[in-house]
């Protein structure tokens, strides 16, 4: 049988020589030479040379274990003479072993890692990684150990795991942001004589809130017109903080001052500045200075460092307010003035007032803006801002005037301000009452006395304001010796009743019935209307059958027998 | 000319078992180590197990450890793969390959692959 | 052990230089070899060791390894070249590992 030890070989080998492996033997060998060894299989022939009497295996090149770390080959023992196999043909190993000849490596040239200035001693960072590509398993030529070359005593790095840690308590990115940390990755376990490979780390601090927001100054003084409107930016303030990103944000607001009201602070989130805007309309002429004390804070503190002392600061905004020439301002913001319908032209109405806001009190004069009086009905006196009529009046065709007024600086034309001017016309009883419609009514021939006939009643274009008192009567013309009466019903109506039992529309055919109707106003207004009656024949119901059309009218305008 | 053609695959359920056969031809079968190989539908390739040239050594990948067995009779020139215990996860394309003599594991020539699909 | 890390495709114009990468720690010190796989087909050796061309493969592909990652290189790729290409080395004793694959698009 076959009598061999596992075969090993030293990578790298550098000697002149070949390189001895090993020697295949088999007992039935009795070292006559009669038996001829035979390699072959991986890298036989080429890479492994066996002495075909001896047996003894040879590597001719130099061999490299991350290149192929096992050789599988097969032996073959023969009998020289017979040329039979005296064993049988086997496979056996050459296992490549490893010398240290890679240094480590690590997985990045270089590394990035930030970490939280700050921190505290022994905070990670990162972890750094460096491989060996020798053997693990034999020996310590990949066993790695890490070492920091340079960064102490900001920082420290874990000998077996690579970790970074901090090593300086109160790191401060305001001071300083950046370090480059070079760390050594060493094999043989660190050892003398071990590779060693290195990489760059580039720490950067990252921003904590530890550092407040500052005015670089205590006071501003800003100037805006009186006219500004809400909304106005006024000026500008910005405090600094020596943080960045979210722990730089700042938020102002006005904390206190006479300006409280009328002004208003924004935050600019892009700049970082507090903008002063108005709040309230401004009067120079009421105030011409406001303080405010505005205040910057972080809104993202950090618990941690409020014992720094509170994360806002204050300034003190003083804010000139400037004169700005001004339109006239009206005393009321309209007028509502009445005046009776009967009034005679130049009446006085009433009057409006305006006056120069500004500090120099220019005189005004007034107009009346012609497009809202086309008719030119009323006038105003240009010095003294009086309102009278310059046209009659008459209620029933326009009972509201709404006119506008022009009140204008007599030194500079174009400050004018307008004002509306609602003139209501008071009734007066100018019109007497009539009847709402024209009367033509009928009475049958076999009529009953006291029949009522028709109801009668009359509209008025006055608007009395205790409301209209209609009375009715006959003409005292008609009167007396009338076939008809009239009752008043005092409720603004009025009924025509018969006064005979019977009525014959042979003889009369119609009747004319003057009515006159009286207001109860002052002064009273009268008028007379008439009513025409026909006679017709009737049948047991009392509807009408026929009736003539004609009427004998006489020129009194009344029937004979009214 | 140098030839693997790969045999024995189809369908088979979880826990079932399988055995592929790989005949060789236009080489001396005997001289060279021998591997398998599988690729998943869709995915890359796998190795999956290595026999040397007489058969003495063998090794596996850690995924099929202990439930597949190779084997090679250099007299019928033809390698064996016994898969047992076999898993939905084992569906692939089954392809033998020859390890090139001085070329350092490198796979030269492959079969045409067999497909082996594992599901209830 | 080493773990090779292959991007998942890489496009190319006819003509042009296509180049497929195979990272590794130290993978210089690793052995190298390539496979071109079309669709339905066996892989095909195309470079091993490293550099190394079989006989049968066009000149066009190359091979180089050095630092931490192995390149396979298409100069003036055709048509005929675009299928799915495997980097492989040993990974541990006589264990064989294979990169994740790079599929290679030949446009127009």
């Known amino acids: 049988s076959w009598m061999w030890n596992q075969f090993f070989l030293l990578e790298e080998y550098t000697g002149s020589d070949y390189q001895y492996v090993g020697k295949l033997h088999s007992d039935q060998d009795r070292g006559d030479g009669s038996l001829k060894y035979i390699l072959s299989g991986d890298g036989a022939g080429d890479l492994f040379i066996i002495n075909e009497n001896t047996g003894d295996i040879q590597a001719t090149k130099r061999l490299d274990r991350e290149e192929k770390p096992v050789y599988i080959l097969r032996a073959q023992a023969i009998n020289r003479r017979t040329g039979r196999p005296v064993e049988p043909e086997s496979e056996f190993i050459i296992k490549i072993h490893d010398i240290n000849d890679n240094e480590p490596i690590f997985t990045k040239e270089v590394y990035t890692a930030t970490v939280p200035e700050m921190s505290d001693v022994g905070t990670f960072v990162v972890q750094v990684t460096a491989t060996d590509a020798d053997d693990p398993t034999y020996g310590n030529s990949a066993k790695v150990v890490y070492s920091i070359l340079q960064g102490q005593p900001y920082f420290s790095v874990e000998s077996e795991t690579g970790i970074i840690k901090t090593a300086l308590l109160n790191m401060d990115r305001e001071n300083r942001e950046q370090y480059q940390v070079v760390i050594q990755a060493k094999d043989m376990g660190g050892q003398m004589g071990g590779l060693s490979g290195t990489t760059t780390v580039n720490i950067t601090l990252t921003d904590v809130n530890d550092n407040p927001p500052r005015f670089p100054q205590s006071t501003y003084q800003f100037k805006t017109p009186e006219s500004s409107p809400p909304g106005t930016p006024i000026g500008r303030i910005k405090a600094s903080d020596a943080d960045v990103g979210e722990n730089a944000e700042i938020e102002y607001s006005i904390t206190d001052g006479e300006g409280l009201d009328m002004f208003d602070v924004i935050t600019d989130q892009e700049t970082q500045e507090g903008i002063i805007t108005v709040k309230k309309l401004l009067d120079f002429e009421k105030k011409k200075v406001y303080t405010l004390k505005v205040e910057a804070s972080n809104p993202h503190v950090e618990p941690r460092f409020l014992y720094l002392g509170p994360f806002k600061d204050s300034a003190t905004v003083r804010i000139v307010v400037e004169d700005v020439d001004e339109p006239p301002v009206f005393s009321k913001l309209a007028y509502i003035l009445q005046i009776r319908e009967d009034a005679q032209i130049n009446t006085t109405i009433g009057s409006v007032t305006a006056q120069d806001p500004d500090a120099a009190r220019n005189p005004v004069k007034y107009s009346v803006d012609r497009h809202t009086d086309m008719d030119r009905i009323f006038n105003i006196d240009s010095g003294n801002g009086s309102i009278f009529t310059s046209k009659l009046l008459d209620r029933e065709t326009l009972l509201w005037h709404n006119i506008t007024v022009i009140a204008t600086e007599i030194n500079n034309p174009k400050q004018s301000s307008r004002v509306p001017l609602y003139i209501k016309v008071l009734d007066v009883n100018d019109n007497a009452p009539e009847f709402a419609e024209f009367y033509e009514t009928f009475v049958c021939e076999k009529a009953k006395a006291d029949q009522l006939i028709q109801t009668l009643r009359a509209v008025d274009k006055d608007d009395p304001y205790s409301g209209h008192q209609f009375s009715f009567s006959l003409a005292p013309e008609a009167a007396s010796g009338s076939n008809f009466t009239i009752q008043d019903n005092k409720d603004n109506t009025a009924g025509i009743l018969t006064r005979k039992n019977g009525y014959n529309r042979h003889e009369m055919s119609t009747y004319l019935l003057p009515v006159v109707i009286s207001d109860n106003d002052y002064p009273v207004q009268s008028s007379t209307g008439t009513v025409t009656v026909r006679v017709c024949a009737c049948d047991h119901h009392g509807n009408m059958q026929s009736c003539h059309a004609e009427a004998l009218i006489h020129p009194t305008g009344l029937s004979t027998g009214a | 000319q140098v030839q693997l053609l790969e045999s024995g695959g189809g369908l088979v359920q979880p826990g079932g078992s399988l055995r592929l056969s790989c005949a060789a031809s236009?080489?001396?079968?005997?001289?060279?180590?021998m591997h398998w190989v599988r690729q998943a539908p869709g995915k890359g390739l796998e190795w999956v197990s290595f026999i040397s040239s007489l058969g003495s050594y063998t090794y596996y990948a850690d995924s099929v450890k202990g439930r597949f067995t190779i084997s090679r009779d250099n007299s019928k020139n033809t390698l064996y793969l016994q898969m047992n215990s076999l898993r939905a996860e084992d569906t692939a394309v089954y392809y033998c390959a020859r390890e090139t003599a001085g070329y350092g594991y490198a796979f030269d020539p492959w079969g045409q692959g067999t497909l082996v699909t594992v599901s209830s | 052990d080493i773990e090779l890390t292959q991007p998942p495709s890489v496009s190319v114009s006819p003509g042009q230089t296509a180049s497929i990468t195979c990272s590794g720690d130290n993978i210089r010190k690793y052995v190298v070899h390539w496979y071109q796989q079309k669709p339905g087909q066996a892989p095909v050796l195309v470079i091993y060791r490293d550099n190394n061309r079989p006989s049968g493969i066009p000149e066009r592909f190359s091979g180089s390894n050095s630092g931490n990652t192995a390149t396979l290189t298409i100069s003036g790729t055709q048509a005929e070249d675009e299928a799915d290409y495997y980097c492989q080395s040993w990974d541990s004793f006589l264990a064989v590992v294979f990169g994740g694959g790079t599929k290679l698009t030949v446009l127009g």
């Open positions: 236009g080489f001396t079968f005997s001289s060279y180590a």
